[in-house]
């Protein structure tokens, strides 16, 4: 990563260093240390103070984005004296060269697409590269298949999501022969970026007085169980006047997903379609294919 680290320190330095791959800030251990503290301040003056590691000469920042530039700070007291040191972590490179409009979505339960746009001041020969690290930081995933626009990487397709965890760190680096390119980074929750498939196996069975709709919950990337789903049924009478309200029915997920409603014979032709969402986010899937029941002469 092309980022300059500039140290602001008194004469006897702690030699503070930051490894952006592990998000670990470390410094030279001092004898007879009585107190240590590390923190960062971002451009909006928000302060993040992680727990110190066991050896007390390093700390790891779990969930931070660095592209706006941050300042790290370490305070150490020993029985003899106090130390303080700042480390500036700017996003070096020309302003406006970083990838922008970055977004990702998971679909079909095991595929993910990420897309971005070239920075407005990025030179013609800019090339972007995507790296993903899971929250356990055990693995770095490099984009296996880039989506290109005139030779520039503007997206990434992943068909193996096994390295992801529930929260992941995305980094888009840039290179150019002409100038330094800024990086862009982002933290994304898999549950917030997944687009569900519609429910499957939708069936309708009617008797003389009622119709029973059954369906199966969609397969998802996240490990969800039945209570995590909310469904919406659109029961629609065919050949009605334009502007007639469809009946939208909300149904909570259950071990057996079913909805029973009164509909007596002879019944007009109806259609039913269903969509699914995470009950806490209500990010609706597309509708399932409409299933028809009833008769034209009902």
């Amino acid at each position: 990563e092309k980022s300059d680290l500039r140290t602001v320190a008194p004469a006897s330095s702690l030699n503070v260093r930051f490894d952006s791959r592990t998000m670990n800030l470390s410094w030279d251990c001092q004898e007879n240390t009585t107190f240590s503290k590390c923190f960062l301040t971002d451009k909006k003056n928000r302060v993040v103070e992680p727990r110190l590691s066991n050896n007390e000469c390093s700390c790891t920042f779990r969930e931070i984005c660095l592209h706006e530039g941050v300042t790290f700070e370490v305070h150490v007291n020993t029985s003899q004296r106090g130390f303080q040191q700042k480390l500036l972590y700017p996003n070096s490179g020309r302003e406006g060269t970083a990838a922008q409009n970055f977004s990702c979505f998971i679909y079909n339960a095991d595929l993910m697409n990420c897309t971005w746009a070239r920075g407005p001041t990025a030179p013609r020969d800019v090339q972007y590269f995507l790296y993903i690290r899971n929250s356990k930081r055990r693995r770095e995933i490099r984009c296996p298949y880039y989506i290109q626009d005139s030779g520039t990487h503007v997206g990434c397709h992943l068909d193996n999501l096994s390295g992801l965890t529930s929260r992941n760190y995305f980094l888009v680096n840039g290179t150019s022969r002409e100038i330094g390119i800024q990086f862009f980074d982002s933290l994304l929750d898999t549950k917030k970026i997944e687009r569900f498939n519609p429910p499957s196996n939708v069936t309708v069975r009617c008797n003389t007085t009622h119709c029973l709709v059954r369906w199966k919950q969609p397969r998802t990337y996240q490990k969800l169980s039945y209570l995590d789903f909310q469904y919406q049924l659109d029961v629609h009478r065919k050949n009605t006047q334009p502007g007639t309200e469809n009946l939208l029915i909300n149904v909570s997920g259950d071990l057996e997903n079913r909805y029973n409603f009164p509909s007596s014979e002879p019944r007009a032709k109806h259609s039913v379609k269903i969509r699914a969402a995470d009950v806490r986010i209500l990010n609706w899937s597309s509708w399932s294919e409409a299933i028809e029941f009833g008769s034209d002469d009902g």
Partner: antibody, heavy 120, light 111 residues
């Protein structure tokens, strides 16, 4: 109608093992996650373990580690709990349950329970 | 010793409203993790009453509602009925641990 049918009450001597079964009807076990919880008058409910999708394996509560084993036979839709080196304070009602949500763990449907008495 | 603290008993007359509190800490309810509530009628298995803080599974009447704020949660029962007499338990998870942690339970008596 989904149901969890548990095996009958057991009386065991200290140091012995007990195996409790939990048969699922009305649904395929392979599509479900089963967790086990026990209840005593003194300690109340204690979660024992179950399938954790993040780890993709069965995880056990620390306090039962080494003494508890949870297995499944999906061909007969039955889950099993084995607890070994029984002590008198293992006397409890043992419940199997179906996970309704993983985040956080929510137990959606419970079996009727199996009373295990440990007494010399 | 239960991780979540509940009153040992509450009571109310038929038709009344009662609430049951559940107090945790910053490493469970306040972490923040969602809270579930279970009802255990005498001599029976627990039944899920509320999940994700305030959602009811199908079949649970809307007389039961719940809320969560900070490190505590509460269950409210309106229009109290004789067959609501039961033990009620709250549950959530503890940061860094797998599985559920439970409250000690509250016995509801309908006078």
């Amino acid at each position: 109608q989904v149901q969890l049918v548990q095996s009958g009450a057991e009386v065991k001597k200290p140091g012995a093992s007990v195996k409790v079964s939990c048969k699922i009807s009305g649904h395929s076990l392979s599509e479900l996650s089963i967790h086990w919880v026990r209840q005593t008058p003194t300690k109340g409910f204690e979660w024992m373990g179950g399938f954790d999708p993040e780890e993709n394996e069965i995880v056990y509560a620390q306090r039962f580690q080494g003494r508890v084993t949870m297995t499944e036979d999906t061909s007969i839709d039955t889950a099993y709990l084995t607890l070994s080196s029984l002590r008198s304070d293992d006397t409890a009602v043992y419940y199997c349950s179906i996970v309704g949500s993983f985040s956080p763990l929510t137990l959606g449907l419970w079996g009727k329970g199996t009373m295990v008495t440990v007494s010399s | 010793q239960a991780v979540l603290t509940q009153p040992s008993s509450v009571s109310g007359a038929p038709g009344q409203r009662v609430t049951i509190s559940c107090t945790g800490s910053g490493s469970n309810i306040g972490a923040p993790y969602d809270v579930s509530w279970y009802q255990q009628l005498p001599g029976t298995a627990p039944k899920l009453l509320i999940y994700h803080n305030n959602k009811r599974p199908s079949g649970v009447p809307d007389r039961f509602s719940a809320s969560k704020s900070g490190t505590s949660a509460s269950l409210a029962i309106t229009g109290l009925q004789a067959d609501d007499e039961a033990d009620y338990y709250c549950a959530t998870v503890e940061a860094g641990l797998s599985g559920s942690v439970f409250g000690g339970g509250t016995k509801l008596t309908v006078l």
